[in-house]
C-alpha cells in the first residue's frame, strides 16, 4: 500500500495492515530464583516478573510458568540479558596444579518450545568462559535477534547455573519479545 | 485490520494506523567527553553527536543537553553500546596484598527522567567487574530492550567512569531509540 | 493516520502505509568458514547460512557472496553476534617477559558497502582485549543498532580472526537485519 490512495470505488483486499500499538509485546524482569527440577540435558529455566515495575505483557502475549506464550504467528525480535555474579573461579588453581583445564563458564540460552515438536529449539546462546582473577566477579550476557514464530510457540530463558544469576535489580536481568 | 477490506460504505474508526517512516527515531554516536558536574549518587551522563556521520534524529525525536526527548507515548526499543578502555586494574595487586578486594568495575545505565517524578528510573544496566591481566584492556558493554515511554520522558546514558569511555570511533560507542 | 477514519468521499494520498509482513528481513546463521582473500586493511568477512535451520531471508532481502543486499531504502535494525573461542593468549607471558604488551584482541565489525562510494563504512564495532588466564576461552561479542540505508547498500560482518569464530552452532554466531 506504499504511497497508494484509499479510493472509495474499489473493494480490493489489501495486504494485512495493523496498528502497531496492538501487537504482542512483553518485557519481563528478574526475580530471585529458587531451585527447581528441570529436564535432563537442559539448563534450568528462569522465572520472571511480568507486571510489576518495568515489566509488562500486552496484546495477548502472556507469561505463565517460566514461558512467554506466542499468541500470533509472525516475525519477533527476542532479547534477554542475564547478569551473573560469583566468587573466585578455581580456574587459576586448576591450571597451576596441572590438572585438566576445562574452564568454568556461564551460559544463557533462549529456547523455543513447540508442542508438536519433541525437542526444544535453541534460538540464541551466549556462552563465556569465566576465569576471573578477583574474588568477586560479575558480568552480563546479552542476546537479541529476530525469529519466525508460530502461534502457540513458547519461549524461555535457560541458564547454566541458576544460583549465579543477579536477581537484585530489574535493569540487570531481563527478557523480552515483540512482534515486528 | 488484519486481512480486512477497506470498503467505502462504512465510516468505522479503525485502530490507529501510521506510516512507519514517520515514527520517532534516533541514533547518536560518541564524542569526546568533557568533565561535567553530575547529580550526587548518579553516574555522569554522556553527551552525544546527533547529526554528523552515522548519527541522526528524526520525526520529532530531539536530542538536547545529553537527553533524548520522547515526543510521543508508546513502546520504544532503546539500545546503547559503550566501549571502555583502561590500563591494568589494580585488582590482582589488591588481592595479593590482602587488602579488601572490591573489584574495579565498568557500568552503563540507560536512565529515564520524567519531570513529574522526582527520581530517575534506571531502565537498563550493564555492569562488569574488571580485573584484567594485560596492561591495556578494552571491551564493550551492550544493552537493548523495549519500554513503554510517555511523551516528555527523557533518556540518557550514564557511565561509572567517563574517562574510560572510548570516544575515538562512532561505531564503538552509541545510543539509540525508536518507536515500535 | 493515527486515529483517523477511512471515509469514502476523499481521495487523499496518505503517508505510505505497508503491511509489516512484507518488509525486508533476514536472519543468517554461522557456517564453517574457509580462508579467503580479503581487501588489504580490512578484516575478513564471514559467510553465512541463509535458508537452513533458523536462517531465512524474505521480502526481497537477499544474501549473496557474504553480503546482505538492501532492497529498499529506509531505517533498518541490524544486529550480529559472533562467538569466539581460542587457546591461552600469550598476554601474560608477554607481560612477564617485559616485551611490549599489546594485548590480543577480538573484533567484530558490521560494514556497509555502497557501490557509489569508494570506501566501506563501519556501522558497528565490538572489540575486546583477550588476556585469559585459562587455557581455553570462549566469549561472544554482540552488536545491534538502527541505521538509515539506501536501496542497493550491502552489509557484511568482518572479524579480526576468522579462525577463532565458533561455527559449531547456529545460535552462537548470527547476523540479521530488518526494515523498521
Amino acid at each position: 500500500l506504499k504511497g497508494q490512495e484509499f479510493a472509495p470505488s474499489h473493494q480490493q483486499v489489501y495486504a494485512p495492515l495493523r496498528a502497531d500499538g496492538d501487537k504482542p509485546r512483553a518485557h519481563l524482569t528478574v526475580v530471585r530464583q529458587t531451585p527447581t527440577q528441570h529436564f535432563k540435558n537442559q539448563f534450568p529455566a528462569l522465572h520472571w516478573e511480568h507486571e510489576l515495575g518495568l515489566a509488562f505483557t500486552k496484546n495477548r502475549m502472556n507469561y505463565t510458568n517460566k514461558f512467554l506464550l506466542i499468541p500470533e504467528s509472525g516475525d519477533y525480535f527476542i532479547y534477554s540479558q542475564v547478569t551473573f555474579r560469583g566468587m573466585t573461579s578455581e580456574c587459576s588453581e586448576i591450571r597451576q596444579a596441572g590438572r585438566p583445564n576445562k574452564p568454568d563458564s556461564i551460559t544463557v540460552v533462549i529456547t523455543k518450545v513447540t508442542d508438536s515438536y519433541p525437542e526444544p529449539t535453541q534460538l540464541l546462546m551466549g556462552t563465556k568462559s569465566v576465569c576471573e582473577v578477583g574474588s568477586n566477579w560479575f558480568q552480563p550476557i546479552y542476546l537479541g535477534a529476530m525469529f519466525s514464530l508460530q502461534e502457540g510457540d513458547k519461549l524461555m530463558v535457560n541458564v547454566s547455573d541458576i544460583s549465579l544469576v543477579d536477581y537484585t535489580k530489574e535493569d540487570k536481568t531481563f527478557f523480552g519479545a515483540f512482534l515486528l | 485490520l488484519k486481512g480486512q477490506e477497506f470498503a467505502p460504505s462504512h465510516q468505522q474508526v479503525y485502530a490507529p494506523l501510521r506510516a512507519d517512516g514517520d515514527k520517532p527515531r534516533a541514533h547518536l554516536t560518541v564524542v569526546r567527553q568533557t568533565p561535567t558536574q553530575h547529580f550526587k549518587n548518579q553516574f555522569p551522563a554522556l553527551h552525544w553527536e546527533h547529526e554528523l556521520g552515522l548519527a541522526f534524529t528524526k520525526n520529532r525525536m530531539n536530542y538536547t543537553n545529553k537527553f533524548l526527548l520522547i515526543p510521543e507515548s508508546g513502546d520504544y526499543f532503546i539500545y546503547s553500546q559503550v566501549t571502555f578502555r583502561g590500563m591494568t586494574s589494580e585488582c590482582s595487586e589488591i588481592r595479593q596484598a590482602g587488602r579488601p578486594n572490591k573489584p574495579d568495575s565498568i557500568t552503563v545505565v540507560i536512565t529515564k527522567v520524567t519531570d513529574s517524578y522526582p527520581e530517575p528510573t534506571q531502565l537498563l544496566m550493564g555492569t562488569k567487574s574488571v580485573c584484567e591481566v594485560g596492561s591495556n584492556w578494552f571491551q564493550p558493554i551492550y544493552l537493548g530492550a523495549m519500554f513503554s515511554l510517555q511523551e516528555g520522558d527523557k533518556l540518557m546514558v550514564n557511565v561509572s567512569d567517563i574517562s574510560l569511555v572510548d570516544y575515538t570511533k562512532e561505531d564503538k560507542t552509541f545510543f539509540g531509540a525508536f518507536l515500535l | 493516520l493515527k486515529g483517523q477514519e477511512f471515509a469514502p468521499s476523499h481521495q487523499q494520498v496518505y503517508a505510505p502505509l505497508r503491511a509489516d509482513g512484507d518488509k525486508p528481513r533476514a536472519h543468517l546463521t554461522v557456517v564453517r568458514q574457509t580462508p579467503t582473500q580479503h581487501f588489504k586493511n580490512q578484516f575478513p568477512a564471514l559467510h553465512w547460512e541463509h535458508e537452513l535451520g533458523l536462517a531465512f531471508t524474505k521480502n526481497r532481502m537477499n544474501y549473496t557472496n557474504k553480503f546482505l543486499l538492501i532492497p529498499e531504502s529506509g531505517d533498518y535494525f541490524i544486529y550480529s553476534q559472533v562467538t569466539f573461542r581460542g587457546m591461552t593468549s600469550e598476554c601474560s607471558e608477554i607481560r612477564q617477559a617485559g616485551r611490549p604488551n599489546k594485548p590480543d584482541s577480538i573484533t567484530v565489525v558490521i560494514t556497509k558497502v555502497t557501490d557509489s562510494y569508494p570506501e566501506p563504512t563501519q556501522l558497528l564495532m565490538g572489540t575486546k582485549s583477550v588476556c585469559e588466564v585459562g587455557s581455553n576461552w570462549f566469549q561472544p561479542i554482540y552488536l545491534g543498532a538502527m541505521f538509515s540505508l539506501q536501496e542497493g547498500d550491502k552489509l557484511m560482518v568482518n572479524v579480526s580472526d576468522i579462525s577463532l569464530v565458533d561455527y559449531t552452532k547456529e545460535d552462537k554466531t548470527f547476523f540479521g537485519a530488518f526494515l523498521l
Partner: antibody, heavy 116, light 107 residues
Framework: EVQLLESGGGLVQPGGSLRLSCAVS????????VDWVRQAPGKGLEWLGV???????NYNSALKSRFTISRDNSKNTVYLQMNSLRAEDTAVYYC??????????WGQGTLVTVSS | DIQMTQSPSSLSASVGDRVTITCRAS??????LNWYQQKPGKAVKLLIY???RLHSGVPSRFSGSGSGTDYTLTISSLQPEDFATYFC?????????FGQGTKLEIK
Amino acid sequence: EVQLLESGGGLVQPGGSLRLSCAVSGFSLSSYGVDWVRQAPGKGLEWLGVIWGFGGTNYNSALKSRFTISRDNSKNTVYLQMNSLRAEDTAVYYCASGNFDAMDYWGQGTLVTVSS
Amino acid sequence: DIQMTQSPSSLSASVGDRVTITCRASQDISNYLNWYQQKPGKAVKLLIYYTSRLHSGVPSRFSGSGSGTDYTLTISSLQPEDFATYFCQQGNTLPFTFGQGTKLEIK
C-alpha cells in the same frame, strides 16, 4: 519441593577422617550451589565452603585445606570430606542450597563428635 | 574476612512487642545481608535476603533495612512462633560470615 538430608555424622577420634553426605531432591546439582555450614555446641554458624552448579568450589581458608567438597550428580549427592579432625571440629554440620549470596534451604544437620 | 557483629546477643520480649536486632559489618557489604531463624531441632530458615526482601512464605511482620555496614531486622508484632535465635550473614564476599546470633526469649 526442595529437600536436603545430611548423613554420615558420628564419633571420630582426633586425627581421623569422616565423609558427610548431603542428599538433595527437588533440584539438579548441576545448576545450583550447595554450601556446608557448621555450628559448634552453643556457638554461632560457621561457613565451610560451597560447590557451585558449574562444579567450582570455594572454601573457608581458616580450615587450612583439611576439608574438601565434591559431588556425584548421578546420585544428586554432595560430600564433605573432613581430614585431620580436631576436637574443635565437633559440631552439627548442615548443608544448604541457595543463590550466590544466601542459603535459601537447609538440611536438619548431622552431629560430628571428635573425641578420644 | 568480614566480621559481623550482632546485637543484642539475647533479648526478652512479649507477644505483640516490636523487636529490633542489629548487625554491623566490618566493611561495606553492598546490601548483601541476610537474616535467618533457627529453632531447636528444626532446619534453619532464610527470612530476609538482600537487606530487605522477604523470602517466600515469610510473614510480613518481618522486615529488614540498612545499607553500607549497618543493618536491622525488625519484627513488628511478635508472635509466639517467633521466639528463636536469629543470625545475620553477609553474602558479599567469600568466606561468607555470620553474626554470633541473637536469642529471642519470652519475657
